[in-house]
């Protein structure tokens, strides 16, 4: 069961796995949640009654019964991991801790104007986990305004002490705020020859890459496939680092694959969610339970519902045995990965889906695209919303996209003449406008946030956020789309679609059924040639066919230009403006969302 509140002056007895240092109980709970085995924790706050060496200790705990005896202890704060909860979880921690020195390896020291600048430096440094900044009031003159970038093996401080006039905080890489490049390249037949910081067993290079991405010290990896000549190293995933942050040497070896941590784009890829099944593969580990199950899918469900289960192996039933049910072996290990992987024994293995909630909801696979035709089907574009105005009468005003459970991203020009958010209604999960009746549920708009540099669509900054009055419960028909990653600026999107209920030609009316069109992106140079009277800036992106014929049009404004990359949909553009609709050599112009990621995160993550 999910218990979110913290228990003051309470200590859980026994069950210790490991002790780390965290600046707060809240962050201790996050660390516990991300630890493969932690279910409960006890944090010790600073207190005159406590030994200062125990201040800020975060003891991670496990228990077969999922609970432990409670003991009263002043300054102790205890609680449960969020593994038991169904809500979305994030490791993003923007808090700044005043008068705390978080200890680690100080590998970089430089002058910074502010703690914010120091945090940005940490976020954009490949090695940095956290920082300490000496303010201008710091007693020692030569240390004032010094920004110390730090890292540790675990990503958490090795100790935390009180120190006047300093502030500390964490890298914001997990908040999607890093400008570091996202290196998606995978190199077949390649070994990276740098130092190993850890090794785990993985069924394929993609799982290995995801493990590397959420490992605090891993910058790149080498994976030995099941055909690797040395039997003892088959399925071995080597997690690696180097001083420069890139591999210093790569060596060609058949049946090995190498790649990089995707830390700087982890908000738009699944990292914790290993959803594939591995056939004729057995995962070895500590056995938690053996249960009868009808299929490997059922076995995965059982594992997902058992909070301590990390992975499973299903052995299908022998003919007519046990009512056709096979054996489902629920398993766990110290690091969440199998201790060994065996092939050729007929088992089907996989991982718990419990950790999928640690990934951004937007990375969830949606139903396959319907090929051909222009009308969409239900659930095809679950992030698409229709924004209605109720004044003077109710009508469709613009499109928009769900990007968070309380946030819609749309175009600023939609709100020309809109005096108040009170007249706006957001409908999600809608296919046909005719579904919208008096009693159809909608989301009220609490706030309209228009980019403060917006003047008119053609001059850019045509972007706005709607904060909803209530939160969206994600379902198959209403869920968010991922924002593009700042580290992915060099990605070329080839599978892009524009959707909306807008006109199908210049003089037309709003369509009843949500329309879709696949449209190729056009380079800004090419686009500029087509719009000589306008300035096509890097904050705009264009899409269209040279011959015309398919385009967004009136009423599509604010809606998404959605592009699929590596099985994940990204909100690449917001329908903004164009000359006419679907005219020859007149591509549609969209707001280039990647250029506004910082602005979006600043507005949506504001405390």
């Amino acid at each position: 069961e999910c218990v979110t509140q913290l228990l003051k002056d309470t200590c859980f007895e026994g069950g210790d796995i490991t002790t780390v240092f965290t600046p707060s109980a809240k962050y201790c709970q996050v660390v516990c949640t991300y630890h493969p085995r932690c279910l409960l924790f006890t944090f010790t706050a600073e207190s005159p009654s406590e030994d200062p060496t125990r201040w800020f200790t975060c003891v991670l705990k496990d228990s077969v019964t999922e609970t432990l005896p409670r003991v009263n202890r002043t300054a102790a704060i205890s609680g449960y991991s969020f593994k038991q909860c169904s809500h979305q979880i994030s490791a993003c921690n923007k808090d700044i801790y005043v008068d705390l020195d978080m200890k680690g390896i100080n590998y970089n020291s430089s002058v910074a104007k502010s703690a914010q600048e120091c945090q940005e430096r940490c976020t954009d440094d490949v090695h940095c986990h956290f920082f300490t900044y000496a303010t201008r009031q710091f007693p020692s003159l030569e240390h004032r305004n010094i920004c110390l970038l730090k890292h540790t093996q675990t990503g958490t401080p090795t100790r935390i002490t009180k120190l006047d006039k300093v502030v500390s905080g964490f890298s914001l890489k997990s908040c999607a705020l890093s400008n570091l490049a996202c290196i998606r390249d995978i190199f077949p037949n390649t070994v990276f020859a740098d130092s190993n910081i850890d090794s785990v067993m993985a069924p394929d290079a993609f799982v290995c890459g995801r493990i590397c991405t959420h490992h605090p010290g891993c910058l790149f990896f080498t994976f030995f496939s099941q055909e690797w000549p040395k039997e003892s190293q088959r399925n071995l995933c080597l997690l690696k680092t180097s001083e420069s942050g890139l591999p210093s040497t790569r060596i060609k070896k058949s049946k090995a694959l190498s790649g990089f941590s995707l830390q700087s784009c982890r908000h738009s890829i699944p990292v914790f969610c290993h959803s594939s099944f591995y056939h004729d593969t057995d995962f070895l580990g500590e056995e938690l339970d053996i249960v009868a199950a009808k299929s490997h899918e059922a076995c995965q469900k059982l594992c997902t519902n058992a909070v301590r289960c990390q992975f499973f192996t299903y052995t299908p039933a022998q003919a007519s045995c046990n009512e056709g049910k096979g054996k489902c072996y629920l398993k766990l290990s110290s690091n969440g990965s199998p201790t060994k992987i065996l092939h050729g024994r007929g088992g089907i293995s996989g991982y718990t889906l419990r950790l999928c909630k640690m990934d951004n909801e937007c990375t969830t696979k949606i139903k396959p695209r319907i090929v051909g035709g222009t009308a969409s089907v239900r659930g095809e574009w679950p992030w698409q919303v229709t924004l209605h105005t109720t004044s003077p009468t109710q009508r469709h005003l613009c499109g928009g996209s769900i990007i968070g459970n309380q946030w819609i991203l749309t175009a600023a020009h939609c709100f020309y003449g809109v005096e108040s958010p009170k007249i706006l209604r957001v409908y999600s999960g809608i296919l046909n406008q005719s579904e919208i009746k008096e009693d159809t549920s909608f989301f009220g708009v609490q706030e309209i946030i228009i980019h403060d540099q917006y003047k008119m669509a053609e001059s850019g900054y045509d972007i706005a956020l709607l904060k909803l009055e209530t939160t969206v419960n994600y379902t198959d028909s209403q869920r968010p789309i991922c924002l593009p990653s700042k580290g992915d600026r060099n990605v070329i999107y080839t599978d892009c679609w524009v959707t909306g209920w807008g006109y199908r030609k210049l003089r037309d009316k709003i369509q009843n059924t949500l329309q879709k069109a696949k449209i190729p992106l056009v380079t800004n140079e090419e686009c500029q040639k087509r719009y000589r009277g306008h300035k096509i800036t890097h904050k705009m992106i264009c899409a269209g066919y040279r011959e015309g014929g398919k385009d967004a049009c009136k009423g599509d404004s604010g809606g998404p230009l959605s592009c699929k990359h590596n099985e994940v949909w990204h909100l690449v553009g917001i329908t903004s403006w164009g000359e006419g609709c679907a005219q020859r050599e007149r591509p549609g112009v969209y707001t280039n969302v990647v250029e506004y990621v910082d602005w979006i995160l600043e507005k949506t993550q504001a405390v």
Partner: antibody, heavy 125, light 108 residues
Framework: EVQLLESGGGLVQPGGSLRLSCAAS????????MQWVRQAPGKGLEWVSS????????MYADSVKGRFTISRDNSKNTLYLQMNSLRAEDTAMYYC??????????????????WGQGTLVTVSS | DIQMTQSPSSLSASVGDRVTITCQAS??????LNWYQQQPGKAPQLLIY???NLETGVPSRFSGSGSGTDFTFTISSLHPEDFATYYC??????????FGGGTKVDIK
Amino acid sequence: EVQLLESGGGLVQPGGSLRLSCAASGFTFSHYSMQWVRQAPGKGLEWVSSISPSGGYTMYADSVKGRFTISRDNSKNTLYLQMNSLRAEDTAMYYCAREKASDLSGTYSEALDYWGQGTLVTVSS
Amino acid sequence: DIQMTQSPSSLSASVGDRVTITCQASQDIDYYLNWYQQQPGKAPQLLIYDASNLETGVPSRFSGSGSGTDFTFTISSLHPEDFATYYCQQYHTLPPLTFGGGTKVDIK
């Protein structure tokens, strides 16, 4: 048809800078690793630098490390080599070349299967 | 760094001759070796990749063999257009990607 066209070479004084470009066409540029290789007059081939498809992973010969920067713009199908602090020994014909394969299928070779015609860089006072 | 030693550095031959060039690596490079041809004033052209695979469009008179440290490149019957400089290149360990010193094949 695959084509690579280098430009940006010329005469420059020692200590000066040049930026070479290589415009690619006829293939999906963003799927391929790219390389710069140079050849001093009357001499053999010398590898200079390489860059991965996404542009995030780069490598350099010791002789140019810290002075040259390889980059790419996948939206423009263009590879670049920014050359700073040029020396007389950097005088050469500079070729851009494409690595043969970039997929996860069985046959994966890093042979350089297409080369540009080269651009001449002369460093002299 | 892996050194590639090519021999001979030059050779003279006649049309129709069989020509053999060798390349030796300073350490084991498995089969990760390529062969290129460069005609005067032109860019290099790939002939053989991964020690023995003939590049598409390259005549079958060109062949390669070997693995580990010793490699051989052969032209079974020299054509007039084959007078050029030939280079071997390893890509087993990077950086650097290294080329042999080249073998110039000219007319006897």
